[in-house]
Interface confidence: low
């Protein structure tokens, strides 16, 4: 019996087609992805093949103005339209709190939403009961397939799930659910979840009874043969893991942003064992037409976005200096504003010993593309912020050793004075440079804000200590020459859309007046 698994993950609000790098579509003839194009391909496969499941491995939420405005209603609407069969909860599904998950998505989805390792307690338990499930048995042709869900147990550090949801260890939580499926005579089981490729592989190895793992969170691109676009494969598709009980378990992921549709064909024997698996992600490029019905609906929903982007988010009573002349040479108040917003967006008081889990932000000055003039009645709109942060990136959480941070700050000024983008703006960091010294030895003082303290204060950076830092995904991926970050980071979790972080902060503060306050000094 053959099953076709179509899968997406980390779509992050890319409902419309995008450019090849998953930013805003500029030249339509070269654009990719989007739900209208995805629908065309899914329907084509559904017509051609008998047993098809369309699955999503989480993080539909967060990433573009679509989510900012519609807050998840767009996810439910278009996933319903595409007739997804199941979805696993990702960490970003909790970005607007539990209510922001329940109302727009859980109550509106016409497909099961899954996670076996999230347990509700207190008053929330009855409120959320039945709205998400640990697993679901789906009839496919003449057979049944069990889908069991999982979510990153780091979610409390990455999003806003509140205090009434417990995120258990994935493997511990999955095993009893898979065992229960077995007692229901379900012998074909897919683990669908959002914990990253390393955990996906562990689940394939450790959870008895799981036949296939469909994952997300790490934006992993797997491919067999010559890859069709810019993404470099982390391994073959599917990636085969040998389980502890000797089975070959295919593990798949489909990069991110709706650029690819994962396509995996599995052949099962009559006892539900995987005999063979093969496939590849399908690049959703412009050779695949956008479905006109879905496209019309996208255009209908777009109207509200255009209206939103010109509305006032808040006011500034000072000039927000985002000029290259400032942000690539010295501390600029636009950099301070953005870093303050980044830290504020990551406030998670999850431990009495720590006032917060992260206190530091770094931001490449070249990523700040425009100032905002306060003389327009102080008004700040989404449109204004899109000029400051036009690349559609995310502000991510990484863990780095102090020695890596020191290298990053040396790189920040290694060719100072040429208006290059790698000059770092900061938050929760005091840095002093001496430009008279040779490149690679210009950082004379680097103090960082403590987290394990009741009264935050600045202490000297310790080379062997592991620190959490918020930074743009561009830097996490080694952009602007920050190869040491990419090579040496110990953990990387994708964060929220950059503009959304800053706009939320401004809306919260209502009136802002960031200053230049001595975070970056030259001796």
């Amino acid at each position: 019996w053959e099953l076709t698994i179509l899968h997406t993950n980390d779509v992050h609000s890319r409902l419309e087609q995008t450019s090849e790098d998953s930013s805003k579509c500029v030249n339509a003839s070269r654009c990719m992805g989007g739900v209208a194009r995805l629908f065309t391909k899914v329907q084509q496969i559904r017509r051609a093949e008998p047993n098809v499941l369309l699955l999503d491995a989480g993080d539909q939420y967060q990433g573009t103005i679509w989510f900012t405005v519609y807050k998840g209603a767009e996810v439910a609407h278009f996933m319903n339209a595409l007739r997804y069969d199941a979805m696993a909860l990702g960490n970003h599904e909790f970005d607007n709190g539990v209510e922001g998950l329940i109302e727009p998505l859980l109550k509106e989805a016409k497909f099961p939403i899954l996670s076996a390792n999230i347990k509700a307690k207190g008053p929330l338990a009855s409120q959320i009961s039945g709205l998400y499930l640990p697993y679901k048995v789906l009839p496919v042709g003449d057979e049944v397939v069990g889908i069991v869900g999982y979510t990153s147990k780091e979610t409390p550090f990455l999003s806003n799930p509140g205090t009434n949801l417990v995120f258990e260890d994935e493997i511990t939580a999955l095993q009893p659910e898979v065992d229960k499926l077995k007692t229901l005579n379900v012998n074909k089981i897919i683990a669908l979840g959002h914990s990253g490729f390393e955990m996906d592989k562990l689940i394939a190895q450790k959870v008895r009874g799981v036949d296939v793992v469909v994952g997300g969170h790490s934006n992993t691109f797997l491919y067999t043969g010559n890859p069709p676009s810019k993404e470099v494969p982390a391994g073959k598709y599917p990636f085969i893991v040998t389980s502890d009980d000797g089975r070959k378990v295919p593990v798949v992921q489909a990069y991110a942003f709706g650029k690819y549709l994962g396509y995996l064909k599995i052949e099962f024997d009559e006892r539900g064992n995987v005999i063979s698996s093969h496939g590849n992600p399908i690049l959703l490029n412009s050779s695949i037409p956008e479905d006109p019905s879905i496209k019309a609906d996208i255009n209908k929903w777009r109207i509200k976005l255009d209206n939103y982007s010109t509305q006032e988010l808040g006011k500034t009573i000072v000039y927000l200096d985002g000029s290259s002349q400032s942000c690539r040479f010295r501390e600029c108040n636009m950099g301070n504003l953005i870093c303050d917003a980044m830290i504020n967006n990551n406030l998670r008081h999850t431990d009495e010993m720590f006032w917060n889990h992260v206190s530091m932000c770094i931001l490449n000055g070249g990523g700040i593309r425009s100032p905002i003039d306060e003389r327009n009645n102080g008004t700040i709109t989404w449109e204004n912020l899109a000029a400051v942060l036009p690349f559609g990136g995310t502000f991510d959480l990484v863990q780095l050793k102090g020695s890596t941070l020191k290298k990053a700050f040396e790189h920040s000024v290694h060719r100072y004075g040429q208006s290059t983008g790698e000059f770092l703006q900061v938050g929760g960091i005091h840095v002093v440079y001496d430009l008279s010294r040779k490149p690679g030895d210009r950082v004379v003082k680097l103090d960082v804000l403590c987290t394990k303290c009741r009264v935050p204060s600045y202490d000297p950076l310790k080379m062997d200590e592991v620190y959490k830092v918020i930074l743009p995904n561009f830097l996490a991926n080694g952009g602007d020459g920050f190869q040491m970050i990419k090579d040496e980071l110990l953990r990387h979790d994708s964060g929220d859309q950059d503009i959304n972080v800053v706009s939320t902060y401004i809306s919260k503060m209502k009136v802002i007046y960031p200053a230049v306050e001595g975070r970056i000094k030259f001796s």
């Epitope: 519609y70 609407h77 016409k110 019905s293 019309a296 929903w301 109207i303 509200k304 255009d306 209206n307």
Partner: antibody, heavy 119, light 107 residues
């Protein structure tokens, strides 16, 4: 309360044009679509098109493309629908109707304007 | 265009009767369905949207159900003021289209 008040009945000759107005009050005019729906005598309802006053975005039913023009005057919260090259089968009651921007069902309707096309 | 087929086109019923009107779409409309009531010489009035959501001020004797392409409007106990023509409308795909109407008359 929400009100949509339309202009009065019109009698037109074949080939002529008619312009019907719809004045809105009681809500934020620029945040809802305004639709035009017509109903021929004894017949059902037929959607003609819609305009979003917030940015002037218009969508027309293919059937009326080239013959219908929808415009908006935000200063008076008024939407206009002009239908040209009239023929006898355009005799109908024309309604304006408010629709939410993301879900196009019609929660408030004008009282209707009867347009009679006769030689 | 999506065709909306309503049935029956007319029906006779008495006060207190349970009345059911069906609406079939020519393709899936993903629960983007509204129902309207129209009385002679008057504009239509919204009863339900999203298949099941009752518009404010509409009596609870009106209810909706269905999914995919098949939808139903039910009036649990017909009242004198309910004698009218009822229309369904899909708002999934432009152009938005209406059913042909069902006239509910007094038996």
């Amino acid at each position: 309360q929400v009100q949509l008040v339309q202009s009065g009945a019109e009698v037109k000759k074949p080939g002529a044009s008619v312009k019907v107005s719809c004045k809105a009050s009681g809500y934020t005019f620029t945040t809802y679509n305004m639709h035009w729906v017509r109903q021929a005598p004894g017949q059902g309802l037929e959607w003609m098109g819609a305009i979003f006053p917030g940015n002037g975005h218009i969508s027309y039913a293919q059937k009326f493309q080239g013959r219908v023009t929808m415009t908006v005057d935000t200063s008076t919260s008024t939407v206009y629908m002009e239908l040209s090259s009239l023929r006898s089968e355009d005799t109908a009651v024309y309604y304006c109707a408010r629709g939410d921007y993301d879900e196009s069902y019609f929660d408030y309707w004008g009282q209707g304007t009867l347009v009679t096309v006769s030689s | 265009d999506i065709q909306m087929t309503q049935s029956p086109s007319s029906l006779s019923a008495s006060v207190g009767d349970r009345v059911t009107i069906t609406c079939k779409a020519s393709e899936g409309i993903y629960n983007r369905l509204a129902w309207y009531q129209q009385k002679p010489g008057k504009a239509p009035k919204l009863l339900l949207y999203g298949v099941i959501s009752l518009e404010t001020g509409v009596p609870s004797r009106f209810s909706g159900s269905g999914s995919g392409t098949d939808y139903t409007l039910t009036i649990s106990s017909l009242q004198p003021e309910d004698f009218a023509t009822y229309y369904c409308q899909q708002y999934w795909s432009i152009p938005w289209t209406f059913g042909g109407g069902t006239k509910v008359e007094i038996k």
